[in-house]
């Protein structure tokens, strides 16, 4: 299938709202700086059939959005940017959905690499127990955010990557 | 592990509203849909309708169109179905059904309703 | 729209005999979005199979979900006393979202 022109666009909305929902300096934030470990090898695309690679880059929507649809985050983020954010998020996670309904067809394509969702699950459970140990200080989120930031770059990368092979 | 609580049983009159109320609790989260499916007595399973109560993002099957609304609440996490216009053939019970954050990978996650309340019985009589 | 028709409607089996369900769709559906209930009388649905073979947390292994194209079936191995019951089948198709379920098979005691 193809991933509409629109997605891409929405990808890139996503990552500018993200960026402006920074509130304060990362440079004052620079002691709570963390390794979340994020699982790059994952977004590499080059292990995956195209359905396997869908799933995987759904697997980070999705666990962004729910990281950014907690109570915690709706205090934390300027509302109106929050849910603006969100909505690019929903509508991408729409997108990928549409495209492997098509992709699996009934080629029975298998939908996943168990590993490749697992690494990145576990990879948001390390960002939440960070933010709980932190007790979603204004510094945390500021970490989290910058992190997420470089992860959604990995999947707007991917995602380029397979519209290069349509 | 989700929990979901619906509202008490209705008596109705043809033409009239209903609302009912369905309240999440345990592992909840606002960005996965929770859906109203009803059910006749002595029939099948009927999906009516879903919302997204991150977003307020609605779906409502063709059948219901013009006479369904879903609402939801985000704290505490609750979902309202409201049906206008009721009909004999609207006796029912009405679910409400959630996914899970569980199911792996996520994609399949929203396609099926793991987390079920316990039913709200609707009936429409004169 | 997807159509799913399930049978046989009604099914008289004895304990420890196994039974095979089956759900049909007009069109084809991905297994990936084929789902299997289970509803007891009284009972809110349990969900049993999801992604067309996967046992859903706690659904003992004597279900098992198959099938492809059009085809599906869903196999209790060895029927025990809590198994009678009423199994639905579901799709799943998007944009927009669409749930469609079967009209149901009931597995009754013989």
């Known amino acids: 299938c193809d991933l509409p022109q629109t997605h891409s666009l929405g990808n890139r909305r996503a990552l500018i709202l993200l960026a402006q929902m920074g509130r304060i300096s990362h440079f004052s934030c620079l002691k709570d700086r963390h390794d979340f470990g994020f699982p790059e090898e994952e977004f590499d695309g080059h292990q995956f059939q195209k359905a396997q690679a869908i799933s995987v880059l759904h697997e980070m929507i999705q666990q962004t959005f729910n990281l950014f649809s907690t109570e915690d985050s709706s205090a934390a983020w300027e509302q109106s940017l929050l849910e603006k954010f969100s909505t690019e998020l929903y509508q991408q996670l729409n997108d990928l959905e549409a495209c492997v309904i098509q992709e699996v067809g009934v080629e029975e394509t298998p939908l996943m690499n168990e590993d490749s969702i697992l690494a990145v699950r576990k990879y948001f459970q390390r960002i939440t127990l960070y933010l709980t140990e932190k007790k979603y200080s204004p510094c945390a989120w500021e970490v989290v955010r910058a992190e997420i930031m470089r992860s959604l770059s990995f999947s707007t990368n991917l995602q380029k990557r397979l519209r290069r092979k349509d | 592990e989700v929990q979901l609580l619906e509202s008490g049983a209705e008596v109705k009159r043809p033409g009239s509203s209903v609302r009912v109320s369905c309240r999440a609790s345990g592992d909840t989260f606002s960005s996965y849909p929770i859906s109203w499916v009803r059910q006749a007595p002595g029939q099948g399973l009927e999906w009516m309708g879903r919302i997204l109560p991150a977003l307020g993002v609605t779906n409502y099957a063709q059948n219901f169109r013009g006479r369904i609304t879903i609402t939801a609440d985000k704290s505490p996490l609750t979902a309202y179905l409201e049906l206008s216009s009721l009909r004999f053939e609207d006796t029912a019970v009405y679910y409400c059904a959630s996914p899970s954050a569980d199911i792996i990978p996520s994609i399949l996650g929203t396609t099926l309703f793991a987390f079920w309340g316990q039913g709200s019985l609707v009936t429409v009589s004169s | 729209e997807i159509v799913l028709t399930q049978s046989p409607g009604t099914l008289s089996l004895s304990p420890g005999e196994g039974a095979t369900l089956s759900c049909r769709a007009s069109?084809?559906?991905?297994?990936?979005?084929l789902t299997w209930y289970q509803q007891k009388p009284g009972q809110s649905p349990r969900l049993l199979i999801y992604?067309?073979?996967s046992r859903a947390t706690g659904v003992p292994d004597r279900f098992s979900g198959g099938g492809s194209g059009t085809d599906f079936t869903l196999t209790i191995s060895r029927l025990e006393p809590e198994d009678f019951a009423v199994f639905y089948c579901?799709?799943?198709?998007?944009?927009?979202?669409?749930?469609?379920f079967g009209q149901g098979t009931k597995v009754e005691i013989k």
């Open positions: 579901q799709s799943y198709h998007s944009p927009p979202p669409v749930y469609t």
């Open positions: 069109q084809n559906v991905s297994r990936h979005y």
């Open positions: 992604g067309g073979s």
